[in-house]
Amino acid sequence: ITRQSLDPQRRAAPQQKRSSPTEGLCPPGHHISEDSRECISCKYGQDYSTHWNDFLFCLRCTKCDSGEVEVNSCTTTRNTVCQCEEGTFREEDSPEICRKCRTGCPRGMVKVKDCTPWSDIECVHKESGTKHTGEVPAVEKTVTTSPGTPASPCS
């Protein structure tokens, strides 16, 4: 850990940027020391802080789960960005798991949008053009294919 001190007597190592808390805060990529006198740098690839802060530690980098791909690696100022693998997507209401995209649309419907890491395929009725989410209204008794089943958990 690089400690950046208020003490002017301490010599900085070559190429080491020195900083001390500014109005009680440390810059992105750092956290404050327990005595609030120093800004301590986060460890690259291990932890991070994204904004000016007085955190007592840097936050741990996220590790992408199986079923996810790493889009951006963790830096001292930015967390890892993980994305669902091809053929799976993350729903807003259950962001912890990547769900399998449906492979096709029910009879009488056409696909208007492909599967993305953020959304399932989108189907519309051929005639009316109304959307179909894969959920069957309670009054309908027709047999339909079930929506995608969860892939491996994302956390």
Partner: nanobody, 126 residues
Amino acid sequence: EVQLVESGGGLVQPGGSLRLSCAASGFTFSRYWMYWVRQAPGKGLEWVSAINSGGGDTYYRDSVRGRFTISRDNFKNTLYLQMNSLKSEDTAVYYCAKAEGPPTFSLIRTMTVDPGAQGTQVTVSS
């Protein structure tokens, strides 16, 4: 009503071990970060350890890292602190606390102990 009840403290010799527990009720335990803080005689509150809501990320102050282990059971609504290789400087009243996010210097500095809070006394002495 939010309730946090600490237990497990006691008198132990240097080098000994204790396991503290904190039973939580009155809030959705699994949604909150949890901390252990302590207050030594005549001193202010000092942050000891923190754990995120899911329990996957744990953090420690330098003086306890490698000796203390924080953990939580979100089904039992309980927070734990396993304390090994105890030293005389660990003597304090230990409290658990809930929070929306990771601890900050300003948050710990302005933290106060509720009048009804008991804490659990840890005394390390030979």
